[in-house]
Interface confidence: medium
Amino acid sequence: SAPGEDEECGRVRDFVAKLANNTHQHVFDDLRGSVSLSWVGDSTGVILVLTTFHVPLVIMTFGQSKLYRSEDYGKNFKDITDLINNTFIRTEFGMAIGPENSGKVVLTAEVSGGSRGGRIFRSSDFAKNFVQTDLPFHPLTQMMYSPQNSDYLLALSTENGLWVSKNFGGKWEEIHKAVCLAKWGSDNTIFFTTYANGSCKADLGALELWRTSDLGKSFKTIGVKIYSFGLGGRFLFASVMADKDTTRRIHVSTDQGDTWSMAQLPSVGQEQFYSILAANDDMVFMHVDEPGDTGFGTIFTSDDRGIVYSKSLDRHLYTTTGGETDFTNVTSLRGVYITSVLSEDNSIQTMITFDQGGRWTHLRKPENSECDATAKNKNECSLHIHASYSISQKLNVPMAPLSEPNAVGIVIAHGSVGDAISVMVPDVYISDDGGYSWTKMLEGPHYYTILDSGGIIVAIEHSSRPINVIKFSTDEGQCWQTYTFTRDPIYFTGLASEPGARSMNISIWGFTESFLTSQWVSYTIDFKDILERNCEEKDYTIWLAHSTDPEDYEDGCILGYKEQFLRLRKSSVCQNGRDYVVTKQPSICLCSLEDFLCDFGYYRPENDSKCVEQPELKGHDLEFCLYGREEHLTTNGYRKIPGDKCQGGVNPVREVKDLKKKCTSNFLSPEKQNSKSN
């Protein structure tokens, strides 16, 4: 029988009445155009909704926008358009919400052609009040908040000026001209690239990388011949043009650009690209595009300095055309990532790693599913997940895979079961153990979201017809109840719940269409009465993550340690609550060769855990350029995997000697760096 329809499914008592009492409808007095929704702060219940409507006139486009505010998680909305003087807001800039719980909001207004600069509306009290500010420039990008201080903003102008505000947009100063890209780093540092000659495009590969640590009082050139740069974790990356040809290489710095090392990665040509797929303070996943328009490349994982890289996955799908990759960090379990590969026959297959890119495997076939037409052997196949690439190809996939850090082990995704991703209508699958095992959860495509840290999963069928039914599960997707939230079906456009999956409220957005008009409408459902009581100790059970063989001493060991979690029992219908904190008990593992990656000059032959010397380097001194100095490496070929906490066990020896010789890549050495002050 289909999931949720077997006898074992216990029904939640009186849920219709409970949900009916907690369903709130709001009809927006708007013609249907576009709608955008932003949450302001964490656990504040404040939502801002911006509706915009364009009327194309003969000579120009007439635009109208409205701003609404809720402070009860979307149950009621108040029209606050008058707070922004009924001004038309530019949706391409969205609503710039401040970091953490700063309560700051910046809206960028549309201004008439001849004006000297743009206009913004600023709020620092969770959108209760707004201040209008006229800008001395026309913004090209959304205002960017400093992660450390929400009063510091930066923006690029349409004339490529870099503008900074130190008082939350009240006063602006142009700190540099001819800027292509600017990003906040740590400690209120700004990194940016500049062009010298014509433009960003013309100077690509000849840009300079600059840094200011005092909001534009003084500057330091930290890189030349730059193609582009990126920040990931504690790493600063720059792709740099080679001296002799049109190839470029990645350089990496861990000290804000004071010193650089050349990453041990392949160089790329004009048509290729590098991409930081994921980064944390320990390591980085880097995609290196293959030559030619292949649509794939190679994933490499770094060491703790971002310098030495190990090949992680071949034929990694990353289209050059649309720039789509399926690479997904499964946030509900440490070390787990999912992505797609393009196989030799051009079919797309899903791969998963449980150890941060050390090994990749296919996803296990769900117990309750048959292999589809793509499978050569009807008894042996895998689950393949639909993600960004499928969505970009307009397949019937309404949502990317979903996981939440506080809903431990849960992953929800659309997929098909066979030898490769199928273009047929997908079903929804769930894993409750971080991707090791999967079950078909819902037939056909759905929108889905996680509430109450996994205590409730909500889903709505993806349909071209109007809908009025929502499905919910209190047992991690095993059994489903359906609730009719309105008599009059609506054209569904999206599900909205507060980021972080701690809320028990869900908003269903859509529009109603009548003979003459269509209007935006939202239904907010509060599930608090479904989960009547707070969870107690007896509602939780101990779960060992990454457990594959309980009889193995090393069972559950990933990156040198194992973790036991307290997980809500599937049979418990209770509230984790907004203050729920994941309870975990870590335990260190013994070191084995699996806890080490191969050092510079070494590689792992396939299906072998030992690192062996690269033939071309055999017998040579291992000397390499690090931080602008020549280093001599004495190694038996191993370096601990970043973030690995193992102790005892195998302990390969490693030593690096400074040869006290200067060396530079073609990039720059500290002597070449210059500083200047404004």
Epitope: D552, Y553, E554, Q585, P586, I588, S592, N651
Partner: antibody, heavy 124, light 107 residues
Framework: QVQLVQSGAEVKKPGASVKVSCKAS????????MHWVRQAPGQGLEWMGW????????SYAQKFQGRVTMTRDTSISTAYMELSRLRSDDTAVYYC?????????????????WGQGTTVTVSS | DIQMTQSPSSLSASVGDRVTITCRAS??????LNWYQQKPGKAPKLLIY???SLQSGVPSRFSGSGSGTDFTLTISSLQPEDFATYYC?????????FGGGTKVEIK
């Protein structure tokens, strides 16, 4: 109950090898490390190494490297320690000991269950 | 290798006495220290692991303390069955090393 039963006493000549067995019962053999520790007459305890029965990986003390081999047979839940090129100062009681399994952060290699010991005498 | 030095190497005490044995590591071993009791002709028995955690089944009169390089085993009230040799053991780094032992005799 959990116990480790070792093979009987051995008398060997210098230069020979000895293989001591240790049969585990009352717990899952592969889920715990097995250490080997020896004690010369009237002396203290000396750690020789461990074997991880689940994968067969080993870690030996430098002093015994090249002379000791630790193996296991999971089908009969038995660990073995073989010491070659015996000398008279290898005369000792040899113990196998189960490694305590950490319940939280790494707690080091405690040994919570010990075999009764096997006396090995090396004499010409 | 990390050297473990136990003191005293032997001591005489009476039933009911409070007994303290110390163990010093040649370098810091955090709290990765275990204590064992061994009676003549018998295998050692784990008393304390991770410097201060009491192994299940061991009487509460035994306690351990310390971290870094200096550790202590205390028997709050010596019982007749406690006369034995006590060993400390570090398990921070390979190779595992034991102290020389402390023999507790009847006064």
């Amino acid at each position: 109950q959990v116990q480790l039963v070792q093979s009987g006493a051995e008398v060997k000549k210098p230069g020979a090898s000895v293989k001591v067995s240790c049969k585990a019962s009352g717990y899952t053999f592969t889920a715990y490390l097995m250490h080997w520790v020896r004690q010369a007459p009237g002396q203290g305890l000396e750690w020789m190494g461990w074997i991880n029965p689940s994968g067969g990986s080993t870690s030996y003390a430098q002093k015994f490297q090249g002379r000791v081999t630790m193996t296991r047979d999971t089908s009969i839940s038995t660990a073995y320690m073989e010491l070659s090129r015996l000398r008279s100062d290898d005369t000792a009681v040899y113990y196998c000991a189960r490694g305590k399994r950490s319940s939280g952060w790494y707690e080091g290699y405690g040994m919570d269950v010990w075999g009764q010991g096997t006396t090995v005498t090396v004499s010409s | 290798d990390i050297q473990m030095t136990q003191s005293p190497s032997s001591l005489s005490a009476s039933v009911g006495d409070r007994v303290t044995i110390t163990c010093r590591a040649s370098q810091s071993i955090s709290s990765y220290l275990n204590w064992y009791q061994q009676k003549p002709g018998k295998a050692p028995k784990l008393l304390i692991y991770a410097a201060s955690s009491l192994q299940s089944g061991v009487p509460s009169r035994f306690s351990g303390s310390g971290s870094g390089t200096d550790f202590t085993l205390t028997i709050s009230s010596l019982q007749p069955e406690d006369f034995a040799t006590y060993y400390c053991q570090q398990s921070d780094v390979s190779p595992i090393t034991f102290g020389g032992g402390t023999k507790v005799e009847i006064k």
